[in-house]
Amino acid sequence: LTCLGGFASPGPVPPSTALRELIEELVNITQNQKAPLCNGSMVWSINLTAGMYCAALESLINVSGCSAIEKTQRMLSGFCPHKVSAGQFSSLHVRDTKIEVAQFVKDLLLHLKKLFREGQFN
């Protein structure tokens, strides 16, 4: 996790910085939301547990043509050790529950804020 989020800087970014930047991006999405986010697209809900970064990416990568979450998708890929492609699903998905992208982002943001406040970056 030491090479996360190198979009803004040339060198490796500490995990705490990468997580903070992801949180701030999710805040931006939430605050700047005028119309329904991603036209109200629905994504699989996930269990916010150990492998949630990959699970979150697997869910969001299935949303296409939504520029508002492209940066989030890129940032999440930095937290996920394996390559994720559309249509891929892990056991962390709650496969019977779909929620709007806006709700997904809100839930993810809250969970990441809690982790960050408690100093849990990995």
């Epitope: 903070r20 805040v27 939430t30 809250l110 804020k113 809690k114 406040r117 100093g119």
Partner: antibody, heavy 120, light 107 residues
Framework: QVQLKESGPGLVQPSQTLSLTCTVS????????VQWVRQPPGKGLEWMGV???????SFNSVLKSRLSISRDTSKSQVFLKMSSLQTEDTATYYC??????????????WGQGVMVTVSS | DIQMTQSPHSLSASLGETVSIECLAS??????LAWYQQKPGKSPQLLIY???RLQDGVPSRFSGSGSGTQFSLKISNMQPEDEGVYYC?????????FGSGTKLELK
């Protein structure tokens, strides 16, 4: 408009448990986090803990063993319980709304506070 | 825990004067800093969050700056209603912590 109001006993015996209620209006507990802060007479502010909008809680580690926070969303109330009170727990206890849609945690609306004295 | 050190402990200013209050964090808190004003017998009121964002209804004579570990609150054109105790607060890491306060009085 947004309002928070603390209620509870003004006097608690040493070693007893303090129970406080924060009743809110003008916002939903499922959309905003509620924080607890206390202030001993003539002293500074100390963060105690938070009731997150999803019902989870986080606490100041120095108080964690004595503290619990719960809520009743249907009544728009958040409850704080603190056990084994000592004289140094004498303070004004505040509940406050968290700014929430921000990367940082801050307190944008405060209750008027309830003064709690621990004495026999 | 992140320690927040405020200075000065107290100061007095004349009407119309500009005053500054400093806040030093014991470690990097990015821009996750808020400022509050508290008047005697009242609850604190939010002035500024995220270092420099003014809370709704707060006069523009209040401004905040800084990043990392060093922050300041500036009050230009001191008014009688600006008397009170000012606290900084870090919202970066639990436990959330406050500065010890700066008492501002009118000369």
């Amino acid at each position: 408009q947004v309002q928070l109001k603390e209620s509870g006993p003004g006097l608690v015996q040493p070693s007893q448990t303090l129970s406080l209620t924060c009743t809110v209006s003008g916002f939903s507990l499922t959309n905003y986090h509620v924080q607890w802060v206390r202030q001993p007479p003539g002293k500074g502010l100390e963060w105690m803990g938070v009731m997150w909008s999803d019902g989870d809680t986080s606490f100041n580690s120095v108080l964690k063993s004595r503290l619990s926070i719960s809520r009743d969303t249907s009544k728009s109330q958040v409850f704080l319980k603190m056990s084994s009170l000592q004289t140094e727990d004498t303070a004004t206890y505040y509940c406050a709304r968290d700014g929430t849609i921000a990367a940082m945690d801050y307190f944008d609306y405060w209750g008027q506070g309830v003064m709690v004295t621990v004495s026999s | 825990d992140i320690q927040m050190t405020q200075s000065p402990h107290s100061l007095s200013a004349s009407l119309g004067e500009t005053v500054s209050i400093e806040c030093l964090a014991s470690e990097d808190i990015s821009n996750y800093l808020a400022w509050y004003q508290q008047k005697p017998g009242k609850s604190p009121q939010l002035l500024i969050y995220h270092t420099s964002r003014l809370q709704d209804g707060v006069p523009s004579r209040f401004s905040g700056s800084g990043s990392g570990t060093q922050f300041s609150l500036k009050i230009s054109n001191m008014q009688p209603e600006d008397e009170g105790v000012y606290y900084c607060q870090q919202g970066y890491r639990f436990p959330l912590t406050f500065g010890s306060g700066t008492k501002l009085e009118l000369k």
